[in-house]
């Protein structure tokens, strides 16, 4: 909370309200929607960001082929239930008592059911594949320059440890960024790959979550990298459980 600066704002989360009534009269920033105090020296969890958002006055061979168990977030926005640490609760329900299980990035991983549905544990998303298509440029980007720039971005802007950026693939105009982070690899204080991916997604859409910073200006050797399409695939440590009806649809 001390990272909230003297002017009492939260550099890493504009979806907060900050006031000088924290311990010792210091600036304290609370997430909209949940009222939870957030640590402004790091990324805010995706669950709290989604909750704030809902409450705010408001294919080539060299590329990775997502596995059959990969999830895409097709359900869109919802007002999630977050646990005491700001993470997604394993079971989410809407106002009409329809419930479903989610993974650690809040994406549905079961069919929808009723209040009797059980979600025994929050299943970790350990592999995220960010699939981007950039706008036409005079020529292809240099792969190693592109790789270095995206790794720098995740390290410096999102504070994600470089070891969690597993690979950057490129075959013009498609870029794929692979993030991997097993439960055993994630130490206290490490940014979660799900949170980093969400901040990146919002940046790419021109909806930066950072306070007062300009939007994302991605350049490779001075050449602007403008993204025209984004798809994100989520792979869980335990495969999702959907009925055959959905799988054959």
């Amino acid at each position: 909370h001390t990272a909230a600066q003297d002017n009492c704002t939260c550099p890493t989360n504009k979806m907060t309200v900050c006031s000088p009534d924290g311990p010792g009269g210091r600036c304290q920033c609370r997430a909209l929607g949940s009222g939870m105090a957030v640590d402004c020296s790091t990324l805010t969890s995706k669950c709290l960001l989604l909750k704030a958002r809902m409450s705010a006055p408001k294919n080539a061979r060299t590329l990775v082929r997502p596995s059959e168990h990969a999830l895409v977030d097709n359900d869109g926005l919802y007002d999630p239930d977050c646990d005491p640490e700001g993470r997604f609760k394993a079971r989410q329900c809407n106002q009409t008592s329809v419930c479903w299980c989610v993974n650690s990035v809040g994406v549905r991983r079961t069919d929808k059911g009723d209040l009797s549905l059980r979600c025994d544990e929050l299943v970790r998303t350990h592999h995220i594949l960010i699939d981007l298509r950039h706008r036409p440029t005079a020529g292809a980007f240099n792969h190693s320059d592109l790789d270095a720039e995206l790794r720098r971005l995740f390290r410096e802007r999102y504070r994600l440890h470089p070891k969690f950026v597993a690979a950057v693939h490129y075959e013009q105009p498609t870029i794929q960024i692979e993030l991997r982070q097993n439960t055993s690899q994630k130490a206290a204080g490490d940014v979660d790959i799900g949170d980093a991916a969400y901040y990146f997604e919002r940046d790419i859409k021109g909806e930066s979550l950072f306070q007062g910073r300009g939007g994302l200006d991605l350049r490779v050797r001075g050449e602007p990298l403008q993204v025209e399409r984004t798809l994100i695939y989520y792979l869980d440590e335990i495969p999702p459980k959907f009925s055959m009806k959905r799988l054959t649809a």
């Epitope: 309200v17 000088p20 009534d21 924290g22 009222g35 939870m36 105090a37 005491p84």
Partner: antibody, heavy 116, light 111 residues
């Protein structure tokens, strides 16, 4: 010095609405949350919700959502709590406080009596 | 919602003796840095008065016989040497998440 001064006692009929005001002075009104708390006769404290006058952001206790409305007039440094569809169990003293958890300054309280 | 359970409901202590009031939360209200628990004193016909903020920070103007401790789910308000003017009802409140609930109160009397 910091002061919160609330409006006077009210007597209302069931089904009516009441609007309690809380005038702040001695600090920058837009920088702090204003919380509202209910205390029924002989009972404990119950958190209703809060408002951040600097942006009009509000939070509500689900129990009061839909019936309580929190607003603020920054030009008058005054916060308001309106409670609608009054019933007998709304008879209570209502307090405003600066800050939410750990409210460091409180109004004197406004007694609202709901009686037919 | 986080439920705060205060104990005891009422307490009688002799003047000059130590008084201890407990507050247990239904889930942790602490991070590694801070505990989001606060203590108030309320005398009849008066608004609550903040004594302790963030579990252990004494509010300005509050006598140093009052102290707060605890983290996680268990918190304690201690009055080291009870004075006559300390007769009141004491409440804990968390500010971890919405709604910021209060404990049921502890009535402190002189034995």
């Amino acid at each position: 010095q910091v002061q919160l001064v609330q409006s006077g006692a009210e007597v209302k009929k069931p089904g009516a609405s009441v609007k309690v005001s809380c005038k702040a002075s001695g600090y920058t009104f837009t920088n702090y949350w204003i919380g509202w708390v209910k205390q029924a006769p002989g009972q404990g404290l119950e958190w209703i919700g809060d408002i951040y006058p600097g942006g009009g952001y509000t939070n509500y206790n689900e129990k009061f959502k839909g019936r309580a409305t929190l607003t603020a007039d920054t030009s008058a440094s005054t916060a308001y709590m309106e409670l609608s569809s009054l019933r007998s169990e709304d008879t209570a003293v209502y307090y405003c406080a600066r800050g939410t958890g750990g409210g460091d300054y409180w109004g004197q309280g406004t007694l609202v009596t709901v009686s037919s | 919602d986080i439920v705060l359970t205060q104990s005891p409901d009422s307490l009688a202590v002799s003047l000059g003796e130590r008084a201890t009031i407990n507050c247990r939360a239904s889930q942790s209200v602490s991070t590694s840095s801070y505990s989001y628990m606060h203590w108030y004193q309320q005398k009849p016909g008066q608004p609550p008065k903040l004594l302790i903020k963030y579990a252990s920070n004494l509010e300005s103007g509050v006598p140093d016989r009052f102290s707060g401790s605890g983290s996680g789910t268990d918190f304690t308000l201690t009055i080291s040497s009870l004075q006559a003017e300390d007769v009141a009802v004491y409440y804990c409140q968390h500010s971890w998440e919405i709604p910021y609930t209060f404990g049921g109160g502890t009535k402190l009397e002189i034995k």
